[in-house]
């Protein structure tokens, strides 16, 4: 039961995380105008991965897409790539994990197959989360660098009467959404990997084969001491192919109309 709960929770956490990564990638507020020097600005600038926007006091908001591909900074392209890779891996991971869920039964899929799928999706979620965290962190680093560069520029060339106010940008809401979402996806992936360990049979049990030696009646079971005594083995998660009793998690049913969602 704990394995099912861990797997289910891992799936849900990853699902929320990936939804967050998608939301962050689509959001326009990756960087927002720094209002430290002018908290009551009549024109507010903010930028995303795909377009930059201007919101006026009048309520009018205008957004312009980055229609050039080659003219964009390499770092921005890298961030876009990381976020897209994160989304793609996360989406594939979700698809795989749906079939790997213990509570969903598809045909006569064995636990070993489900364990492998759970591990695969878990790794995908971990990489997806890392991609998102890396993407957001690269963008944040870019912002910090540009912020201090523009701050330095602000205080140079002020000799004349005319001041040119340079717009500085700071962290936008999308960065925080991205960090949290990446973290959740990562946590979800770790949970799936943990669940996989519980799902996987530690070793395969075969039906006992009796070898009759002269004068001795010894039942030989492959697997050595552990298999014959049962000590240290996870009996709950082991398939026993001799028609013995099965635990609730082990019961295999034939597909019904409720099995395919």
């Amino acid at each position: 039961m704990a394995v099912t709960a861990c797997q289910g929770l891992g799936f849900v956490v990853s699902l929320i995380g990936i939804a967050g990564i998608i939301a962050a990638t689509c959001m326009d507020q990756w960087s927002t105008q720094d209002l430290y020097n002018n908290p009551v600005t009549a024109v507010f600038n903010y930028q995303g991965l795909w377009r930059s926007c201007v919101r006026e006091s009048s309520g009018f908001t205008e957004c312009r897409g980055y229609f050039t591909l080659l003219g964009l900074p390499a770092m921005l392209q890298a961030v876009r790539a990381l976020m897209i890779v994160g989304i793609v891996l996360g989406a594939i991971g979700l698809l795989v994990s749906i079939f790997a869920l213990k509570c969903i039964r598809i045909g006569s899929m064995e636990d070993s197959a489900k364990a492998n799928m759970t591990l695969t999706s878990g790794i995908m979620f971990i990489v997806s989360g890392l991609c998102a965290i890396a993407g957001v962190s690269v963008f944040a680093n870019m912002l910090v660098t540009n912020f201090w560069m523009s701050t330095a520029n602000m205080y140079t060339g002020m000799g004349g009467m005319v001041q040119t106010v340079q717009t500085r940008y700071t962290f936008g809401a999308a960065l925080f959404v991205g960090w949290v979402a990446g973290g959740l996806t990562l946590i979800g992936g770790v949970m799936m990997c943990i669940a996989c360990r519980g799902l996987a049979p530690e070793e395969t049990n075969y039906k006992a084969v009796s070898y009759h030696a002269s004068g001795h009646s010894v039942a030989y079971k492959p697997g050595g001491f552990k298999a014959s005594t049962g000590f240290g083995s996870n009996t709950k998660n082991k398939k026993i192919y001799d028609g013995g009793a099965r635990t609730e998690d082990e019961v295999q049913s034939y597909p019904s109309k409720h099995d395919y969602v």
Epitope: N38, A42, V43, S52, S58, G59, F60, T164
Partner: antibody, heavy 118, light 113 residues
């Protein structure tokens, strides 16, 4: 047809109070940022206050901050300017305006006159 | 605060003439986010409230005759009337729309010779 009609002006003693109203019609009042602008007897234009669409943000110049309060009633399509601790330099024609693209004021009312004198 | 300086304070013209008036700001009104200049021009005919002519420095408001042209960027702006008509005799104001407090120029009065 867009119409802005100001009212509530008059003669008031220094230190006194006055509340100006602006009745808006011909447009969706709640969807626009509104401002008050005054014109001094010397014909200088001075921005007095701005209230953002939702009414959650208000802006004032230092000259009126703490004395004037802009507010709006979207249900009544009315803009208000509560003026207190009035000074002689507040004597002016007060206009109600609508903000559009570029933070420009595309429509102005006919104005209401405020005279602060002892 | 951004200071708006208009020149000349008055202009005497004859109808049909081309007129140019200037507006300078103490700070740049160019917004880097959309590369637009947050300056507007108004016309005030005596006894009437001001009327919007241009926003974003050069975008003509609907109903404004095309003999009026707004130009300039950063801190220097110009309003040009190519063929002055009698109905153009008014006071012209420029306004900073970029940052609070919104500030107006002192105006340029257009008079008939």
């Amino acid at each position: 047809d867009v119409k802005l009609v100001e009212s509530g002006g008059g003669l008031v003693k220094p230190g006194g109070s006055l509340k100006l109203s602006c009745a808006a019609s011909g447009f969706t009042f709640s969807s626009y940022t509104m401002s008050w602008v005054r014109q001094t007897p010397e014909k200088r234009l001075e921005w007095v206050a701005t209230i953002i669409i939702g009414g959650s943000y208000t802006y004032y110049p230092d000259s009126v901050k703490g004395r004037f309060t802009i507010s709006r009633d979207n249900a009544k399509n009315t803009l208000y300017l509560q003026m207190s601790s009035l000074k002689s330099e507040d004597t002016a024609m007060y206009y109600c305006t609508r903000l559009v693209k570029g933070n420009a004021m595309d429509y102005w009312g006919q104005g209401t006159s405020v005279a602060v004198s002892s | 605060d951004i200071v708006m300086t208009q020149s000349p304070s008055s202009l005497t013209v004859t109808t049909g003439e081309k007129v140019t008036m200037s507006c300078k700001s103490s700070q740049s009104l160019l917004n880097s986010g959309n590369q637009k200049n947050y300056l507007s021009w108004y016309q005030q005919i005596p006894g009437q409230p001001p009327k919007l002519l241009f926003y974003w420095a050069s975008t003509r408001e609907s109903g404004v005759p095309d003999r009026f042209t707004g130009s300039g960027s950063g801190t220097d702006f110009t309003l040009t009337i190519s063929n002055v008509q009698a109905e153009d005799l008014a006071v012209y104001y420029c306004q900073n729309d970029y940052s609070y407090p919104f500030t107006f120029g002192a105006g340029t009065k257009l008079e008939l010779r």
